[in-house]
Interface confidence: low
């Protein structure tokens, strides 16, 4: 992580991206350790910020406003050179969210996507963003940057992602920043869960009693695997929603999930997928589609007896 | 459910000022932008403006630029649509809608202009 | 300005017949598009955004497609309360802008 020969390097935890209000720990790295080091903003490269206060380590900056949005460098102590201090660091950009109403995040053609597949993530608004920034959680970096196209009815950027590899997978969400304040970002769009499938072999599916039912008799979908998966997902065709159970060890040696749909109102073909809880966002192969046929009188569609997962919240474990 | 309620008919005198009221309910109210809509008497809609909730910000299309105004109360999730120095040709319907491709409308408010 | 042709601007159709408005942009427009039924004292009703996004709760029977420049919105199967007026509305670029209107009614 060092910068070059007489380079500190500065870096920001948890991430560059930082909720108004919020805090960071920006990190000076400086010869192999994190030693006295003095925080510069913007291109006053030569006055140092926070009235020359020396920092040890790291500086936790908060509660932030629009104000500490910007570019940040740091030099690190060096007692026998000229100065005293080593040359600037790298800059750092932190930017300040929460700025403006937060703008749409869509993904095309879906969130679940097979390994080696692209996704293109579309984000607009009504608002007119001049830059659009795409973050993925738990990432350190900068977030990807896209010029706004169109005009102020919607502005929009497609983020392009892949091939699509495990790595990738994740919560995203995106900001938008309007011109002449390029770091001061709106608040995020709601989170997207991207999923990637077909890492791992399918999951077996099935149904009791059957695959075909009176209407109002209950039925319950089993999903099992001699793979150690801890969560299962079922989805059904034209659905958005996705329900998951942790996995249960069978005295046969398999690992199984029970989703009971309740008494069969319409039917509806099914599939499932099995999941690790260290990669909650990378799911096997599909199980072969289940098609469940209900006899008798549909009334409305299937009542769900536990609430649907929401659009997002895939990728966070399931406690 | 979401829900645009506009303020009723007005009747008015060349000249004078109207304000209209439209007041969001089901929804976060600065989460989406407000257009305005106009429907004169035997003609299609016309796109007048919008206003961004949540800044304040107006935006107006040419022909409607000068005696319009868009504003907010934000507090009572409210748009308004106010115009100045009315003209026989401002007799129309107005309507809200709310977001970027319009979702949902208010009912409409009919303004006419009479001496 | 985009301009919105829409055609026809009146049409009669039986009950039951598929029926086709179509909408052209003067220009791109990706598939930000949206279509509204509107009926005489009632609130204009959104059908379709994004060119063929069906809104919750409006019948299966309307459809949209296209994307760029070209747009269509089909009726499946006429029904008696679908008739009133239909319009096109762009909202790629400021200012939107609609089409000039399709009335439809039933023969």
């Known amino acids: 992580l060092m910068g070059g020969q007489d380079k500190p390097f500065l870096s920001a935890r948890p991430s560059t991206v930082v909720p108004r209000g919020g805090h960071v720990a920006l990190q000076c790295h400086y010869r192999r350790g994190f030693n006295n080091f003095m925080l510069y903003k913007e291109d006053r490269s030569h006055v140092p910020i926070f009235h020359g206060r020396i920092f040890q380590e790291s500086f936790i900056m908060g509660p932030v406003t629009p104000a500490h949005a910007g570019t940040y460098r740091c030099r690190g102590s060096r007692p026998h050179s000229l100065t005293g201090w080593s040359a600037p660091s790298n800059p750092l950009v932190i930017m300040v969210t929460g700025n403006h109403r937060k703008p749409s995040l869509l993904a095309h053609p879906g969130p679940l996507l097979k390994s080696g597949e692209t996704v293109i993530l579309q984000c607009w608004s009504d608002v007119a963003f001049e830059h659009f920034f795409l973050h993925r959680e738990g990432i350190s970096e900068d977030p990807s940057r896209l010029v706004g196209q169109a005009h102020d009815g919607v502005s929009k950027a497609n983020f392009s992602i892949g091939p699509l590899m495990p790595v990738l997978a994740g919560t995203y969400r995106c900001y938008g920043s309007v011109p002449h304040s390029p770091y001061q970002l709106s608040a995020p769009s709601d989170p997207l869960d991207i999923v990637i499938t077909g890492l791992y072999e399918k999951p077996s599916l099935s149904a009791q009693p059957g695959p075909t039912v009176q209407a109002g008799e209950n039925v319950t979908l089993s999903c099992s695997s001699w793979s150690s998966y801890d969560i299962y997902h079922l989805s059904r065709e034209g659905e958005a929603h996705e329900r998951r159970l942790r996995a249960v060890p069978k005295v046969n040696r398999t690992f199984q999930a029970d989703f009971p749909l309740g008494p069969a109102t319409h039917g509806g073909t099914y599939r499932c997928f099995g999941s690790f809880r260290a990669l909650p966002c990378v799911w096997s192969n599909s199980s072969d589609p289940l098609l469940v046929s209900v006899t008798g009188n549909p009334s409305s569609s299937w009542p769900s007896p536990t609430e649907p997962s929401s659009k997002s919240g895939i990728c966070r474990h399931l406690h | 459910q979401i829900q645009l309620v506009q303020s009723g008919p007005e009747l008015k005198n060349p000249g004078e000022t109207v304000k209209i009221s439209c007041k969001a309910s089901g929804y976060i109210f600065t989460n989406y932008g407000m257009n305005w809509v106009k429907q004169a008497p035997g003609k299609g809609l016309k796109w007048m403006g919008w206003i961004n909730t949540y800044t304040g910000e107006p935006t107006y299309a040419d022909d409607f630029k000068g005696r319009f105004a868009f504003s907010l109360e934000t507090s009572a999730s409210t748009a308004y649509l106010q115009i100045n120095n009315l003209k026989n040709e401002d007799t129309a319907t107005y309507f809200c809608?709310?977001?970027?491709?319009?979702?949902?409308w208010g009912q409409g408010t009919l303004v006419t202009v009479s001496t | 300005d985009i301009k919105m042709t829409q055609s026809p601007s009146s049409m009669y159709a039986s009950l039951g017949e598929r029926v086709t408005i179509t909408c052209k942009a003067s220009q791109d427009i990706n598939s930000y598009l949206s279509w509204f039924q509107l009926k005489p004292g009632k609130s204009p009703k959104t059908l379709i955004y994004r060119a063929n996004r069906l809104v919750d709760g409006v019948p299966s029977r309307f459809s949209g497609s296209g994307s760029g420049q070209d747009f269509s919105l089909t009726i499946s199967s006429l029904e008696c309360e679908d008739m009133g007026i239909y319009y096109c509305l762009q909202y790629d670029e400021l200012p939107y802008t609609f089409g000039g209107g399709t009335t439809l009614e039933i023969k």
């Open positions: 809608a709310h977001g970027p491709w319009l979702a949902y």
